[in-house]
């Protein structure tokens, strides 16, 4: 049902779900603290282009009765019991920063008449692709798949001379959230990548993937999965691999590879590591007492999402226009704002844009070095290290069907 | 182990400037808001300004808007506050801090502190 939003008069509320069940395990406190930082600066910034207004959050939390998993599998009902618990204290703001988790922010999004803009930190997923008033402040799978493919078919680069259409996806249902829906867009049949590739199997149990290393029998040479370093270590140990094998690790939101004094372990040297350019927030984790510094990217997102909201309403404010308008909620979309670390663009549907980055581990110096970038913005990528040292025959990436090695 | 070190202060007249600079040591200074706090003989410490760690925000108290400017240079490890257009009630211990955000930097939420520095404005 429609419900009134404390959003006119020169005082503008943001409503912070804060659900028990989220993408990441981040303290409720740290995010409050993003949030409250986001408040401070979108003030400093509204008074100084001269509107003297007040922004305030209230933060919705939920009771943690019922849904009490704390991932984001009891999630679906929690997003509509909090926005209950808003609808009934008729306490809606102007944005709705809140829901990280797909199946949360897929049913709100579905079951309610938003006719307000909603902010996630997260929402991986591809059911929460296009949604029109939906804003999603993390790298979607889309965004991976969209890499992947591009990825794939590059033949031109000195280290990368073939097409690839084949690829085993490992995805064994432990995935932190990210993850899941990460590879849970790569099997889903009808997806681009599904699409674009001639073959793809899912290999669900540790020895499927233990067995594929040195299978002289293998359909690909290619095998993604998602996690950290140590995830693949528990997975692979120090088993032989193939030579031919290249395994994809996508780990975004871990920054732990451009840290200083950082050693790629002997068992790295097969794979490529897909992660997210730092940027400015590069840190070294032994100066971070207990407060980690916001290599927290879902911190970081909640932040960015209260500058957004802050950076549209001074847009609809100079402009003289209403901000409980369908206009405003369909606005956040195709625009670049001042984020807290630097600019930060979305797409036409509202999704972030950003720079990923593919490292290799270097066999002369054992260090992490970056073999390309690429735009998700413009959909390409910019090889960076033209000669890199692989463990890869004659330097360069073998082809992904057995046999046919490196030309 | 995480060191602050302040420089620039000393005796001026009223109406004149001075620019106070921060040396950070000891902790990954991109990763954290910088600011500036005084220190009036006999009462509280009082937050001044601050700066994200991008430094593309800055936010400052009323006492402090338009005459006093706050930045950083993440390469060199250094924050620096220019004060412009000195009164005598500006006359205090000038202390830089760290933390993770502006927000609870003004909190004194898990602040690093420097010794500080003695800025005395003469009229």
């Known amino acids: 049902s429609q419900v009134s939003q404390n959003c006119h008069n020169g005082s503008y509320e943001i409503s912070v779900l804060m659900m028990g069940n989220s993408a990441f395990a981040e303290p409720l406190k740290n995010l409050e603290d993003a949030v409250n930082e986001g408040l401070e600066i979108v003030r400093g910034r509204l008074q100084n282009a001269g509107l003297n207004v007040t922004v305030n959050a209230t933060f919705m939390y939920s009771d943690g009765l019922i849904h009490n998993s704390g991932d984001c599998r009891s999630s679906t009902c929690e997003g509509l019991d909090l926005l209950r618990k808003i609808s009934n204290a008729q306490r809606m703001g102007c944005v709705l920063i809140g829901p990280s988790c797909t199946y949360s922010t897929f049913q709100m999004y579905l079951d309610t008449e938003l006719s307000y803009p909603m902010i996630s930190a997260g929402s991986f997923g591809l059911s929460c692709d296009y949604k029109e008033t939906l804003t999603r402040l993390m790298s979607p799978a889309r965004k991976l798949m969209y890499f992947l493919v591009n990825f794939w078919k590059t033949n031109d680069l000195p280290f990368k001379t073939y097409s690839w259409s084949t690829s085993y996806v490992y995805k064994n249902g432990t995935e932190t959230e990210d993850c899941f829906w990460y590879l849970n867009a790569l099997e889903a049949s009808v997806s681009y990548f599904s699409h674009e590739l001639g073959f793809k199997v899912v290999l669900r149990q540790d020895k499927e993937f233990q067995d594929i290393l040195m299978d002289h029998n293998r359909k690909s040479n290619v095998i993604i999965m998602c996690g950290g370093p140590e995830f693949l270590y528990k997975l692979k140990g120090d088993r032989a691999v193939a030579e031919d094998i290249v395994i994809i690790l996508v780990d975004l939101f871990n920054d732990q590879y451009f840290e200083d004094n950082v050693t790629a372990p002997d068992y790295m040297k097969n794979v490529l590591v897909l992660t997210l350019s730092p940027g400015n927030s590069l840190l070294n984790s032994s100066f971070s007492r207990n407060l980690s510094p916001t290599k927290r990217d879902f911190a970081l997102a909640y932040l960015n999402g209260i500058l957004l909201f802050g950076h549209m309403l001074k847009i609809f404010l100079e402009n003289g226009e209403n901000i409980t308008t369908p206009k405003f909620a369909h606005a956040f979309r195709n625009l670049t704002f001042e984020g807290y670390d630097g600019p930060v663009t979305l797409d036409d549907w509202g999704d972030v844009d950003s720079t990923m980055v593919l490292l290799y581990t270097s066999v002369d110096t054992k260090k992490y070095k970056v073999l390309l970038t690429y735009d998700t913005h413009v959909n390409k990528t910019y090889p960076v290290d033209m000669s890199p040292t692989f463990t890869w025959k004659n330097s360069k990436l073998p082809n992904d069907i057995t046999g046919r090695g490196p030309q | 182990q995480v060191q602050l070190q302040e420089s620039g202060g000393g005796l001026v007249q009223a109406g004149g400037s001075l620019r106070l600079s921060c040396l950070a040591s000891g902790l990954a200074f991109p990763s954290y808001a910088m600011g500036w706090f005084r220190q009036a003989p006999g009462k509280e410490r009082e937050w001044v300004s601050c700066?994200?760690?991008?430094?593309?925000?800055?936010l400052y108290a009323d006492s402090a808007k338009g005459r006093f400017a706050i930045s950083r240079d993440n390469a060199k490890n250094t924050l620096y506050l220019q004060m412009n257009s000195l009164k005598p009630e500006d006359t205090a211990m000038y202390y830089c801090?760290?933390?993770?955000?502006?927000?609870?930097?003004?909190?004194?939420?898990?602040?690093?502190w420097g010794q500080g520095t003695q800025v005395t404005v003469s009229s």
């Open positions: 801090a760290a933390a993770l955000f502006c927000a609870n930097l003004r909190r004194n939420k898990d602040n690093y």
């Open positions: 700066v994200t760690r991008s430094g593309g925000d800055t």
